[in-house]
Interface confidence: medium
């Protein structure tokens, strides 16, 4: 094959957005539409990702750069760079393969997504439970009986924690 | 579905030349490379060239630079490939194939082949 | 040109033995090789591209690795409808280069 060669690398003067074509006598070639490069001196342009059904468009694809999705209302992105969207559910759940189902006795979810966790055990720290645990939030452990000896002063449980964007009544 | 449909096979004395067609369907046939690879009797496969048929722009292999022509004619979606000078060791079954392209452009793969066109070189 | 080297050139398998092909390129092809069937009927399909990417179709037994210069076409499960010739091909440079082909019988 007959090809004009340089000292220097010709695809190292093809700028992001572009290709080095081999079937071309290695010019720069620009990326075709739906199609990018994000860095120079590139062999091939990559295909955009494409954000279809559970997936929604985050951020378009150029010809330097990929598209970015997320995940529609009632999903959130898992993996790296949202490679899979799971179903949410309520606090106080966790996903299973037969759907969301309540968090048991003992555990807790104060998320719309991952597993039900076992509440805190207090006993573990020398301490008591303070506020008892539910199904979305976590046993609150308080100071241990030793410390609430006669003549001590008594203790005043924290006030609950606000939910975010929850203005104070 | 992608299709490639080659000419039928040819007998040819040495010195002459011969042309085989690739009628494509079932796809964008201005939007993809078409290679022509050929395989001698008991033998490998030897890539000669291809053509984008969008603009008729070739490759050709260095050994077959001086006598073979690759062509389209977009009407038709069809490709030819003409060799001349025959000779005995250009016996072969010559295949066009189309190029896709997977996740990146710019890298080829020969995804779809034709039958095949048996070309026969004696005297 | 790019030299590509196959080996071995033939080999003889039960069906159900895990079958392994290996192409060897004369300079870095950085993972850009392919891997076509060619079956006695002389049609050819192509199974892998870009070093390890099945193409639609093509049975999951079928895999395929690598780096560099150094590359493997598996076949984890030897079927009866494998019996073919095996080729790698690199999709580095041009001009475009194969192996001399693997012809793989059944036992």
């Known amino acids: 094959f007959e090809r004009t060669r340089s000292l220097q690398d010709p695809c190292s003067n093809c700028p992001a957005g572009t290709f080095c074509d081999n079937n071309r006598n290695q010019i720069c070639s620009p990326c075709p539409p739906n199609s990018f490069s994000s860095a120079g001196g590139q062999r091939t342009c990559d295909i955009c990702r494409q954000c279809k059904g559970v997936f929604r468009t985050r951020k378009e694809c150029s010809s330097t750069s990929n598209a970015e999705c997320d995940c529609t209302p009632g999903f959130h992105c898992l993996g790296a760079g949202c490679s899979m969207c799971e179903q949410d559910c309520k606090q106080g759940q966790e996903l299973t393969k037969k759907g969301c189902k309540d968090c048991c006795f003992g555990t807790f979810n104060d998320q719309k997504r991952g597993i039900c966790r076992p509440w805190t055990n207090c006993s573990l720290d020398g301490k008591s439970v303070l506020v008892n645990g539910t199904k979305e939030r976590d046993v609150v452990c308080g100071p241990s009986p030793a410390d609430l000896s006669p003549g001590a002063s008594s203790v005043t449980p924290p006030a609950p924690a606000r939910e975010p964007g929850h203005s104070p009544q | 579905q992608v299709q490639l449909v080659q000419s039928g096979a040819e007998v040819k004395k040495p010195g002459a030349s011969v042309k085989v067609s690739c009628k494509a369907s079932?796809?964008?046939?201005?939007?993809?490379?078409i290679n022509w690879v050929r395989q001698a009797p008991g033998q490998g496969l030897e890539w000669m060239g291809n053509?984008?048929?969008?603009?008729?722009?070739?490759n050709y292999d260095q050994k077959f630079k001086d006598r073979v022509t690759m062509t389209r004619d977009t009407s038709t979606s069809t490709v030819y490939m003409e060799l001349s000078s025959l000779r005995s060791e250009d016996t072969a079954v010559y295949y066009c194939?189309?190029?896709?392209?997977?996740?990146?452009?710019?890298?080829?793969?020969?995804?779809?082949w034709g039958q095949g066109t048996t070309v026969t070189v004696s005297s | 040109d790019i030299q590509m080297t196959q080996s071995p050139s033939s080999l003889s398998a039960s069906v159900g033995d895990r079958v392994t092909i290996t192409c060897r390129a004369s300079?870095?092809?950085?993972?850009?090789l392919n891997w076509y069937q060619q079956k006695p009927d002389k049609t050819v399909k192509l199974l892998i591209y870009?070093?390890?990417r099945l193409h639609s179709g093509v049975p999951s037994r079928f895999s395929g690795s690598g780096s560099g210069t150094d590359y493997t076409l598996t076949i984890s499960s030897l079927q009866p409808e494998d019996i073919a010739t095996y080729f790698c091909?690199?999709?580095?440079?041009?001009?475009?280069?194969f192996g001399q082909g693997t012809k793989l019988e059944i036992k």
């Open positions: 194939t189309k190029s896709g392209e997977y996740g990146k452009i710019g890298y080829y793969a020969m995804d779809y």
């Open positions: 079932g796809y964008t046939f201005t939007s993809y490379w």
């Open positions: 053509i984008y048929p969008s603009d008729s722009y070739t």
């Open positions: 300079q870095d092809i950085s993972n850009y």
């Open positions: 870009y070093t390890s």
């Open positions: 091909q690199q999709g580095n440079t041009l001009p475009y280069t």
